[in-house]
Interface confidence: low
């Protein structure tokens, strides 16, 4: 019988404690906000926001400029000064709660916690492969804004999501803000509303519309903005929020809101309840039928899937996906199963789902006792009635107000319970090659590069590595710019390859030869590694 | 400061087609939609429609019957209310009105034009 | 449609006095969304375009003069004029923008005793 050599154990051919330093930057505070830009002519840069404070960074990670974005009231505020003499409100720090690009200007805006939750639009001006930021412009009028009615009060001190779409020459901000009692009644900004930035940039267009949480609610009912994106014809939120307004407003669930990216109307807005499960291959005894809910979004993503991972999920190759990861409750504290969870929403099912729901609404003969939902926003109805009345008037259409439609929709865990006791705080999602691969930030501070597969009983690391010595939690929001990815942890911004930040963590030549080809690794006489690692002995033909 | 002109008197026969235009200055056209309103000789007001004219977009008042067609040209600022198959009892005057405009379809009207008085007879 | 139903039909005072005019609605006009009532009034003088008093039912529009107040919640509502000028006698008319179509009262007309 011939003698074979003995089978390394698969995680015994890779060490995560291998440490690897990836290019940082010390932004002097917590990071509150970070958003990239990439020009037509090859300037890009990295925008940080901390409490007082913008910084612009070039691609390298390097200061460019600094801006002073508070304390309101202070002398030294930069942006407040664009505002003209004050006061302008009570004095006060300067969070940022919300900075986009503009990309049609293109500009950077940033809205902050201070001054009613006004913002500053900075138009961009290349320099070299830098950028830098122009003098502000206040996006208030104040001659348009009253407290119960303020166009230009965008950002809620509770948080706020912004998209930014172009429709024709203009720009409209797809605004969701988290409300209480407090922040509704001081120049009150809307839970979901759609504004236009004035040419002039003197601020935002006054009627525009919005949907709040009403007054009798705002103690009880409370949203929280998880993450917003545009695709297609259509703006999506992901929203935690109380399952009912009636019953204990801790039982939480997910839900996405869709309103058109075409028409800045409310009239088409839908909701639909995101269902993510963890359903363990082999059920142990009084486990829940269908698998365990994991009810309440931590972070989430959409992108176009990898080959493999669209077969997996019965779609075409490049069609958008929304990932998200999921938690048991609030604290995302141990329970039985995993602490995470992944799970994946084809945006075309979703559409879907939410047309079909429209048609049970409208269409007849509709289901007696089906209700259009959204109790918090609006008066209770029944479908097909709009909202607080008993009947459709002939020149009303059922489809002209907003609707919760009455199904949700039902995944489960992509990594078969396999992220264990990992808990994920940040998510981006990118196609390399055919392979999908999930970019996660950690609770402690790690990085976790994965590639989304359903099928397997182990996790396809790219990698698995610490940013730094901090342990801080990664941030959820993460930018791209060009090939890497920026993280943000503590006070540090990082910057991480999107192909993995080298191959050394592979410790057999074998498993160092398998690694995905966009990882660029190969053997180098003792360790795996990238060829201008060693240049001399690197190949990636065969194993000695 | 914000201005509604409408323009000057008409003379029509039944069966015919009138076109009354309200040019806007003082304000951003697409900021606001515009509505147009009937007063009959000694009578009250009557709601004819509205536009936006962001996207163009009319809501007829049914009573009107489809007679009533709502334009926006928004290269000059000028909204247009055209109403068809003319009778005597459509001599009246007719205003346009920018409204403010909300979610529920809230809309008041804070600017007037000064009225086109259209006349119908034999 | 909501139909807008105004009294008197013609108010006889003499300036100096307080008015008060009524508008009833066939459906509530408080709309839950916000808690404001959809309620628009306006007056009317001989040969001019209407004019914008009060909005939301309350909220004086901009060059209004204080002597001028709205009030009311759901179908029932009052402008007042607590001390009637000489040019306040005109035609009032009260506007609903709940819902399409929008719909004016047939008016009160404000005459001098």
């Known amino acids: 019988e011939d003698w074979q050599c003995p089978r390394t154990p698969y995680a015994a051919s890779r060490d995560f404690d291998v440490k690897y330093v990836v290019p940082s930057f010390s932004a002097g505070g917590l990071v509150q906000a970070m958003v990239t830009y990439e020009g037509d002519r090859n300037e890009s840069a990295v925008f940080v926001a901390i409490r007082n404070r913008l910084h612009v960074l070039g691609p390298d990670l390097k200061s460019v400029q600094s801006l002073a974005t508070g304390p309101a009231g202070d002398p030294g505020c930069q942006t407040c000064a664009a505002c003209g003499p004050g006061p302008h409100g009570p004095p006060g720090d300067t969070d940022t709660k919300v900075l986009v690009l503009d990309p049609a200007l293109p500009a950077l805006v940033s809205c902050g916690s201070s001054l009613q939750g006004r913002c500053f639009l900075h138009d961009l001006e290349p320099q070299g492969t830098a950028v830098h930021l122009a003098a502000p412009a206040c996006l208030f009028s104040a001659h348009h804004n009253r407290p119960d009615d303020c166009p230009d009060c965008v950002a809620s001190p509770l948080g706020t999501r912004v998209t930014v779409v172009e429709q024709g020459q203009a720009s409209y901000f797809y605004v969701a803000s988290s409300l209480d009692a407090a922040v509704a009644a001081s120049f009150s900004p809307r839970s979901v509303s759609i504004r236009r930035l004035k040419a002039d940039a003197s601020g935002f267009a006054p009627g525009f519309v919005a949907l709040s949480v009403l007054p009798k609610h705002l103690v009880s009912y409370s949203i929280e903005y998880v993450h917003s994106f545009h695709t297609g014809a259509f703006v999506y939120f992901l929203t935690v929020q109380p399952a009912s307004v009636t019953d204990d407003p801790s039982a939480l669930h997910t839900r996405l809101a869709r309103l058109s990216a075409t028409e800045p109307e409310l009239g088409d807005y839908r909701e639909l309840v995101l269902d993510c499960r963890f359903a363990p291959k082999r059920r142990r005894r009084g486990a829940p039928e269908g698998g365990q809910p994991y009810p309440v979004l931590r972070v989430a993503h959409s992108a176009p899937v990898g080959a493999q991972l669209a077969t997996e999920l019965s779609i075409a190759e490049g069609q958008e996906v929304l990932f998200g990861v999921f938690v048991t409750g609030k604290d995302g504290g141990p329970g039985v199963g995993p602490n995470s969870v992944v799970c994946a929403f084809p945006i075309d099912l979703l559409d879907t789902l939410i047309d079909e729901g429209v048609e049970r609404c409208c269409e007849s003969p509709v289901h007696p006792g089906l209700r259009r939902g959204l109790d918090f926003f609006q008066s209770p109805s029944f479908c097909p009635n709009p909202p607080g009345l008993e009947a459709l008037s002939p020149n009303t259409s059922c489809r002209h107000f907003p609707l919760l439609v009455s199904s949700s929709f039902s995944r489960v865990d992509l990594f078969n319970g396999l992220l264990g006791p990992v808990q994920v705080t940040a998510l981006y999602v990118t196609r390399l090659d055919n392979v999908t691969v999930a970019h996660m930030g950690t609770m402690d501070g790690r990085i976790l590069q994965v590639e989304l597969v359903r099928s397997l009983n182990y996790l396809l690391y790219v990698s698995n590595f610490s940013l730094g010595d901090s342990g801080q939690p990664v941030q959820r929001d993460v930018s791209r710019l060009g090939d890497h990815l920026l993280f943000a942890s503590g006070d540090q911004v990082f910057q991480v390859p999107i192909q993995g930040p080298g191959c050394r963590h592979f410790l057999t030549c074998g498993r160092c030869l398998r690694a995905w080809h966009f990882m660029g690794c190969g053997w180098c006489g003792n360790m795996c590694g990238q060829q201008k690692e060693c240049p001399g002995s690197w190949q990636q033909d065969h194993c000695p | 400061q914000v201005q509604l002109v409408q323009s000057g008197a008409e003379v029509k026969k039944p069966g015919a087609t009138v076109k009354i235009s309200c040019k806007v200055s003082g304000y951003t056209f697409t900021d606001y939609h515009m509505d147009w309103v009937q007063q009959a000789p000694g009578k009250g007001l009557e709601w004819m429609g509205d536009?936006?004219?962001?996207?163009?977009?009319?809501i007829y008042n049914q009573k009107f019957k489809g007679r009533v067609t709502i334009t926006a040209d928004t290269s000059t600022d000028t909204a247009y209310m055209e109403l068809s198959s003319l009778r005597s009892e459509d001599t009246a005057v007719y205003y346009c009105?920018?409204?403010?405009?909300?979610?529920?379809?809230?809309?008041?009207?804070?600017?007037w034009g000064q009225g086109t008085l259209v006349t119908v007879s034999r | 449609e909501i139909v807008m139903t105004q009294s008197p039909g013609t108010l006889s005072l003499s300036p100096g006095e307080r008015a008060t005019l009524s508008c009833k609605s066939s459906?509530?006009?408080?709309?839950?969304?916000?808690?404001?009532?959809?309620l628009a009034w306006y007056q009317q003088k001989p040969g001019q375009a209407p004019r914008l008093l009060i909005y939301w039912a309350s909220t004086r529009a901009s060059g209004i003069p204080d002597r001028f107040s709205g009030s009311g919640s759901g179908t029932d509502f009052t402008l007042t004029i607590s001390r009637l000028e000489p040019e306040d006698f005109a035609v009032y008319y009260c506007q609903q923008y709940y819902s399409f179509p929008r719909t004016f009262g047939q008016g009160t007309k404000l005459e001098i005793k």
């Open positions: 009105a920018r409204s403010h405009y909300d979610y529920a379809g809230g809309a008041w009207f804070a600017y």
């Open positions: 459906q509530s006009l408080l709309f839950s969304g916000n808690q404001k009532n959809y």
């Open positions: 536009i936006n004219p962001n996207n163009g977009g009319a």
